[in-house]
Interface confidence: low
């Protein structure tokens, strides 16, 4: 974008401030909260989006059983520390010096501790299971149509490579989308499954992160697919470390 163009906005992230102050007068966008420059040609990392959100004014066709090591984000929102590339720092702490370790999608994977807690590495979430329940419809959706539509959505809206959508399961009214992406599979420029899942989650909640696009209008063969509940399970390359008292 050049300085002469009025349309200096970030198509993939509305939680940005953009101005034509980049090299050669090009449009440059910075994430709210962190002030970090973002690449508007792709999804912004979940860490920078959470940080921006915290700074914004408050307003076989069997279903997969998540493994015992699957994490659910029960802690909700927090103001995360992001590294210079916009990824979550392995250790997160709050204002009261309570610290914990997170995975690559920012979900807590250890018990909470104090400032002495060590998190040696950022553990990658390599498998995400998105569990949806749709509102009642006249009949069940055709599984292959549903599969194709959800794959198209992840490919076109979130620019996630099709090879990372491992499976779409359906047993009315439950839909499960499996995303898989090992460290070795992720090439430069590939959208991260954690970021795609976060954009999808926000879309489903009617809180689209895209600039100026309408909300998500999901249809299967013209029939609206309306989601009434979403649960997301995260599986890490290394199992989480919680004490037994949390598990009972």
């Amino acid at each position: 974008h050049t300085a002469a163009q009025d349309n200096c906005t970030c198509p993939t992230n509305k939680m940005t401030v953009c101005s034509p102050d980049g090299p050669g007068g090009r449009c440059q966008c910075r994430a709210l909260g962190s002030g970090m420059a973002v690449d508007c040609s792709t999804l912004t990392s979940k860490c920078l989006l959470l940080k921006a959100r915290m700074s914004a004014p408050k307003n076989a066709r069997t279903l997969v059983r998540p493994s015992e090591h699957a994490l659910v984000d029960n802690d909700g929102l927090y103001d995360p520390d992001c590294d210079p590339e916009g990824r979550f720092k392995a250790r997160q702490c709050n204002q009261t010096s309570v610290c914990w370790c997170v995975n690559s999608v920012g979900v807590r994977r250890t018990d909470k501790g104090d400032l002495s807690l060590r998190c040696d590495e950022l553990v990658r979430t390599h498998h995400i299971l998105i569990d949806l329940r749709h509102r009642p419809t006249a009949g069940a959706f055709n599984h292959s149509d549903l599969d194709a539509e959800l794959r198209r959505l992840f490919r076109e809206r979130y620019r996630l490579h099709p090879k990372f959508v491992a499976a779409v399961h359906y047993e009315q009214p439950t839909i499960q989308i499996e995303l898989r992406q090992n460290t070795s599979q992720k090439a430069a420029g590939d959208v991260d499954i954690g970021d795609a899942a976060y954009y999808f989650e926000r879309d489903i909640k009617g809180e689209s992160l895209f600039q100026g696009r309408g909300g998500l209008d999901l249809r299967v063969r013209g029939e609206p697919l309306q989601v009434e509940r979403t649960l997301i399970y995260y599986l890490d390359e290394i199992p989480p470390k919680f004490s037994m008292k949390r598990l009972t």
Epitope: H1, T2, P11, T12, G22, G24, R26, C27, D39, C40, S41, T42, R159, H161, P162, K163, A187, A188, G189, D190, V191
Partner: antibody
Framework: QVQLVQSGAEVKKPGASVKVSCKAS????????MQWVRQAPGQGLEWMGW????????KYAEDFKGRVTISADTSTSTAYLQLSSLKSEDTAVYYC??????????????WGQGTLVTVSS | DIQMTQSPSSLSASVGDRVTITCKAS??????VAWYQQKPGKAPKLLIY???YRYTGVPSRFSGSGSGTDFTLTISSLQPEDFAVYYC?????????FGQGTKLEIK
């Protein structure tokens, strides 16, 4: 539907410059990259470079650096290829083609119809 | 630069035949290979991307396979409209490079 429409054929003298345009329609221009490929008569395909339409940043093949400029006007959804210091060997059909932004997406799913540039004294 | 070497450079076959075109990369390109079909006077058309993903609207008789350095485009049963030139392309790293092309002719 998604379409890339290129400007018409050009005849140029050696040493001159040519600017080829490629107007995109049917999709949001800034959500895809624009690549440029040329094909000399009876020859194969040769990649010249591409532009990230969201950031405006171009990247060129080494063989064309210094002679080629790729740009984009997001207000008109148009990409441009300018080639200077033309030689007879630059006689070719020049294609624009849509791609994604990252390396996993640098394949070309939609192509323009091509622009024949003839360099002759 | 990564060289993409296609073989054969030309091929004669009949309608109904099964045809295989191979492409060898000079270094590992993972699965980042695309295949295109080009007819005289026309722009190329995308058939396969990421080695094995058939592009929207491409008939199922076209399939792609391979990873690393060796890739294959297979047409399971040739149709009259399939006679054309086929190109492979690596989309792993810039500069993006193409094979020299395989001309598929009617026997």
């Amino acid at each position: 539907q998604v379409q890339l429409v290129q400007s018409g054929a050009e005849v140029k003298k050696p040493g001159a410059s040519v600017k080829v345009s490629c107007k995109a329609s049917g999709y949001t221009f800034t959500t895809a990259g624009m690549q440029w490929v040329r094909q000399a008569p009876g020859q194969g395909l040769e990649w010249m470079g591409w532009i990230n339409t969201a950031s405006g940043v171009p990247k060129y093949a080494e063989d064309f650096k210094g002679r080629v400029t790729i740009s984009a006007d997001t207000s008109t959804s148009t990409a441009y290829l300018q080639l200077s210091s033309l030689k007879s060997e630059d006689t070719a059909v020049y294609y624009c083609a849509r791609s994604g932004f990252g390396s996993s997406y640098w394949y070309f799913d939609v192509w323009g119809q091509g622009t024949l540039v003839t360099v002759s004294s | 630069d990564i060289q993409m070497t296609q073989s054969p450079s030309s091929l004669s076959a009949s309608v109904g035949d099964r045809v295989t075109i191979t492409c060898k990369a000079s270094q590992d390109v993972s699965t980042a290979v695309a295949w295109y079909q080009q007819k005289p006077g026309k722009a190329p058309k995308l058939l396969i991307y990421s080695a094995s993903y058939r592009y929207t609207g491409v008939p199922s008789r076209f399939s792609g396979s391979g990873s690393g350095t060796d890739f294959t485009l297979t047409i399971s049963s040739l149709q009259p409209e399939d006679f054309a030139v086929y190109y492979c392309q690596q989309h792993y790293i810039t500069p993006l490079t193409f094979g020299q092309g395989t001309k598929l002719e009617i026997k």
